[in-house]
Interface confidence: low
């Protein structure tokens, strides 16, 4: 590859907002490579050298009174101004989460498993995800990926519950997010739909068979008792 | 007190590549950047451009100042070059993966400098360019960089994917692999046995029950035809 030495200048003009725009802090920061060498902090009111490398700049810029006045006014002219312009599509942006629950491993019941609550596509990043088993909150055995930024103004997170699912148990993932007026819940039952339908089919078939058999025997023997001498010979003749 | 929101106007200039960037960041997401070649504002989400505007020419002026500052700082530092910091790379999907359901692979390239990187998506070992997209270099609080690359795809058990990242901090290209992890269905042995036995017993019961019902009914009819002895 290209092995020539590289030289990098970075500048960051930062606006930090507390309680809406009630308190605002403006920072004008200069970097050589990753090293910050000089900065203006609205809480200080003038440029300060962060390293020796920035001393000449701090001295020179602090001698320019017009520049200092401009930087001191930046909390209003720059920060609050930009906050107001972008507020509707940044601060007020709300995208509700898609929630999916699935077992991480396909294990039979009564085996250690990890239930995954996948929460996707939401904005902003502040979110609360809780696990419940049969209505009781589970606090132990809960592992999370933490908040993952997708880079497209959405977030995702996976919250896992280590558990040994037993038949009939109901697991619930509950999500609270600023986009939702009430918590969003998604249930997972310890038996799969296919397993449940197999059980139902089996039990249903068995019961139906017994009913038919019972009814047949009842009708057959009732008639046998009433007319013992009149049976025709042969089977289903 | 922790701040609620942070807006950062982030700029850089890199020599000898002569590459510059100007972007606005809100809480870690890009609002827009300025395309230096086209001299135009590029909004990260199309709808942002309907709510605000930015004059791209102003960014070009800033970048010119950054370039001048860099030349001063390079001399002042006695021509100390940057130390390459290699990226960490993660490949993930946009949402839970389902077979043949459109999804997006995300290649997250993080904690690196300088901001020059070559990223290639590979499907079964071959470069893919259809539908791919990427972000510009995004700033980090430690003044390293982040970047996202995206590949829309249709999940299949046949295909394997790699995000191939080249950076001067890496001895060789870094490949991060992704493939569809098909969940094997549960054995459901008990359920299968219950189902099979239940249906078998049920069927046998229905057949025998029906036979007995028919016999019983015929017997009853025969008795009625003959009358009392």
């Amino acid at each position: 590859g290209d092995t020539r030495p590289r030289f990098l200048e970075q500048v960051k003009h930062e606006c930090h907002f507390f309680n809406g725009t009630e308190r605002v802090r403006f920072l004008d920061r200069y970097f050589y490579h990753q090293e910050e060498y000089v900065r203006f902090d609205s809480d200080v009111g003038e440029y300060r050298a962060v390293t020796e490398l920035g001393r000449p700049d701090a001295e020179y810029w602090n001698s320019q009174k017009d520049l200092l006045e401009q930087k001191r006014a930046a909390v209003d002219t720059y920060c609050r101004h930009n906050y107001g312009v972008g507020e509707s599509f940044t601060v007020q942006r709300r995208v509700y989460p898609e929630v999916t629950v699935y077992p991480a491993k396909t294990q039979p019941l009564q085996h250690h498993n990890l239930l995954v609550c996948s929460v996707n596509g939401f904005y902003p990043g502040s979110i609360e995800v809780r696990w419940f088993r049969n209505g009781q909150e589970e606090k132990t055995g809960v592992v999370s990926t933490g908040l993952i930024q997708n880079g497209d103004w959405t977030f995702q997170t996976l919250v896992m519950l280590e558990t040994v699912p037993r038949s009939g148990e109901v697991y619930t993932c509950q999500v609270e997010h600023p986009s939702l007026t009430s918590p969003l819940t998604v249930e997972w039952r310890a038996r799969s739909e296919s397993a449940q339908s197999k059980m139902l089919s089996g039990v249903g078939g068995f019961v139906l068979g017994l009913l038919f058999l019972g009814a047949g025997l009842f009708i057959y023997f009732r008639n046998q008792k009433g007319h013992s001498g009149l049976q025709p010979t042969g089977f289903l003749s | 007190i922790k701040e609620e929101h942070v807006i950062i106007q982030a700029e850089f200039y890199l020599n000898p590549d002569q590459s510059g960037e100007f972007m606005f960041d809100f809480d870690g997401d890009e609002i827009f950047h300025v395309d230096m070649a086209k001299k135009e504002t590029v909004w990260r989400l199309e709808e942002f451009g309907r709510f605000a505007s930015f004059e791209a020419q102003g960014a070009l002026a800033n970048i010119a100042v950054d370039k001048a500052n860099l030349e001063i700082m390079t001399k002042r530092s006695n021509y100390t070059p940057i130390t390459n910091v290699p990226p960490e790379v993660t490949v993930l999907t946009n949402s839970p993966v389902e077979l043949r359901e459109p999804n997006v692979l995300i290649c997250f390239i993080d904690k690196f400098t300088p901001p020059v990187v070559n990223v290639t998506w590979l499907r079964n070992g071959k470069p893919v360019t259809t539908g791919v997209s990427e972000t510009v270099f995004l700033p980090r609080e430690d003044h390293l960089f982040r970047k996202f690359h995206y590949l829309p795809f249709l999940p299949s058990t046949e295909d394997v994917y790699d995000c191939r990242v080249e950076h001067w901090g890496l001895d060789e290209p870094l490949l991060k692999h992704w493939e569809f992890d098909a969940p094997s269905p549960l054995p459901e042995t008990t359920e299968n046995v219950v189902c099979a036995l239940g249906l078998t017993v049920g069927l046998v019961g229905i057949i025998i029950g029906t036979i007995f019902i028919i016999k019983g009914v015929r017997k009853s009819n025969a008795a009625e035809r003959r009358g009392p002895l």
């Epitope: 590859g1 | 079964n124 070992g125 071959k126 394997v160 060789e172 290209p173």
Partner: antibody
């Protein structure tokens, strides 16, 4: 297990066209990410890569021999065919076919090789 | 076309450690993985090391590979008589596979 076997004429006259067939088993050339390549080795000399064909019929050739080489495959027969035109005595070599898992950039299984002599 | 440079020969006594170097450029070794093959007399080459430093199953851990920048090397420790063979490095250059000129390893004694 994976096996490859080269077949073709042992003797070729100058200016003639050489046709070599690689018959393989233990893998399929319809599997994503698999390629089959040809490599030759003149007596007492180094290995030289000639050509490669991918599962999806993409073909790659050595720059210096590109105009003389053609590679093709018959997936149903598990065969790869290499033709080399305008043979010359300097093309006398053992010709190997080998499998490549393409994302590796390596040849993991090789045939035993077939010696081709170019002489009038 | 020999694109990667290897020493024509190296030698060592049994039990010793030897290394074989392989030098390339930014577009091959610098940007891609390196593979090493062993070719015993009269046989086809055999895969020895792939992905710079990975051994296929069945290859003794006496063989190890490494890569730095545009060069790679193969190290053989505890040299044995059966290691006497030709060793080739190979990489990838855009859409082309490239080989080294080969190194003849002689086990002395």
């Amino acid at each position: 297990q994976v096996q490859l076997k080269e077949s073709g004429p042992a003797l070729v006259k100058p200016t003639q066209t050489l046709t070599l067939t690689c018959t393989f088993s233990g893998f399929s050339l319809s599997t994503s990410g698999v390629g089959v390549g040809w490599i030759r080795q003149p007596p007492g000399k180094a290995l030289e890569w000639l050509a490669l064909i991918d599962w999806d019929d993409d073909k790659y050739y050595s720059t210096s021999l590109k105009t003389r080489l053609t590679i093709s495959k018959d997936t149903s027969k598990n065969q790869v065919v290499l033709t080399m035109t305008n043979m010359d005595p300097v093309d006398t070599a053992t010709y190997y076919c080998a499998r490549s898992p393409r994302y590796r950039g390596a040849f993991d299984y090789w045939g035993q090789g077939t010696l081709v002599t170019v002489s009038s | 076309d020999i694109v990667l440079t290897q020493p024509p020969s190296v030698s060592g006594a049994p039990g010793q450690r030897v290394t074989i170097s392989c030098s390339g450029s930014d577009s091959n070794i610098g940007a891609n993985y390196v593979t090493w093959y062993q070719q015993l007399p009269g046989t086809a080459p055999k895969l020895l090391i792939y992905d710079n430093n990975q051994r296929p199953s069945g290859v003794p851990d006496r063989f190890s590979g490494s890569k730095s920048g545009t060069s790679a090397s193969l190290a053989i420790t505890g040299l044995q008589s059966e290691d006497e063979a030709d060793y080739y490095c190979q990489s990838y250059d855009y859409d082309h596979y490239v080989f080294g000129g080969g190194t003849k390893l002689t086990v002395l004694g």
